[in-house]
Amino acid sequence: VPLSRTVRCTCISISNQPVNPRSLEKLEIIPASQFCPRVEIIATMKKKGEKRCLNPESKAIKNLLKAVSKERSKRSP
């Protein structure tokens, strides 16, 4: 991974594009920390394992988070 100690935040660009929950392998929410003062959301896609930085402020991404958490709560006993 092209990462040096001087890199503070993971995302160079962020995307507003809606993501189909069915095409998601994984959704990571990285809270703000001493290294990066903002929340970062990284979607790993099933296709080729592509990772995409998402805009936490985007309406489409907020809806995605809701859909994913709803799906998770359905699955948990």
Epitope: P2, S4, S13, R38, I42, R52, C53
Partner: antibody, heavy 124, light 109 residues
Framework: QMQLVESGGGVVQPGRSLRLSCTAS????????MHWVRQAPGKGLEWVAV????????FYVDSVKGRFTISRDNSKNTLYLEMNSLRAEDTAIYYC?????????????????WGQGTTVTVGL | EIVLTQSPGTLSLSPGERATLSCRAS???????LAWYQQKPGQAPRLLIY???SRATGIPDRFSGSGSGTDFTLTISRLEPEDFAVYYC??????????FGPGTKVDIK
């Protein structure tokens, strides 16, 4: 459509300064990392600098470290390159380029939108 | 620092022929970090391929990318007149820096 327009190039004496600007339109500028890439006459492409979408990180090629500064004003949809202590070897066409949507340190989507470039000539 | 080498320096072909361009890295590069660009005289570069094999938006399917580790290839299945240009590979490496190869010129035979 998505567009980048560079300005600020010109002829300058060695040791002097110049500030390049790149104005973006047709996309949400504040969402994308931005680069400066240069091309000396008759030569290949050389990456110069990158700035994260929110200005959180900035990185430079070794040959310009300490002389060039990349910055951005998201309220004006504008990217800048402050060039100090210019040398003859800085003579080139300078392009600004947009980092692809969603790029991060784990996956790179390439520089997907380019300006037409502005020419910088350093000479006596 | 990873150095990219492109071969051949110049490729002389006719329209309709297949072009195979090589990009070799001095150390292993993740395919997630490899891109290809096309540049025509007097124009800005254009992104063709990212992630070693994914076509950028609007790029015709005659362009394809492949490879992993230190060896990557850009293939143009059937050269069209507008494909004669210089092609650059590029990698995103640690620090982070974004290195371009020296380019391959595809010209008309």
């Amino acid at each position: 459509q998505m567009q980048l327009v560079e300005s600020g190039g010109g002829v300058v004496q060695p040791g002097r300064s110049l500030r390049l600007s790149c104005t973006a339109s047709g996309f949400t500028f504040s969402n994308n990392g931005m680069h400066w890439v240069r091309q000396a006459p008759g030569k290949g492409l050389e990456w110069v600098a990158v700035i994260w979408f929110d200005g959180m990180n900035k990185f430079y090629v070794d040959s310009v470290k300490g002389r060039f500064t990349i910055s951005r004003d998201n309220s004006k949809n504008t990217l800048y390159l402050e060039m100090n202590s210019l040398r003859a070897e800085d003579t080139a066409i300078y392009y600004c380029a947009r980092e692809g949507d969603g790029s991060g340190i784990y996956y790179y989507y390439g520089m997907d939108v380019w300006g037409q470039g502005t020419t910088v000539t350093v000479g006596l | 620092e990873i150095v990219l080498t492109q071969s051949p320096g110049t490729l002389s072909l006719s329209p309709g022929e297949r072009a195979t361009l090589s990009c070799r890295a001095s150390q292993s590069v993740s395919s997630s970090y490899l891109a290809w660009y096309q540049q025509k005289p007097g124009q800005a570069p254009r992104l063709l391929i990212y992630g070693a094999s994914s076509r950028a938006t609007g790029i015709p399917d005659r362009f394809s990318g492949s490879g992993s580790g230190t060896d990557f290839t850009l293939t143009i299945s059937r050269l069209e007149p507008e494909d004669f240009a210089v092609y650059y590979c590029q990698q995103y490496g640690s620090s982070p820096i974004f290195t371009f190869g020296p380019g391959t010129k595809v010209d008309i035979k």
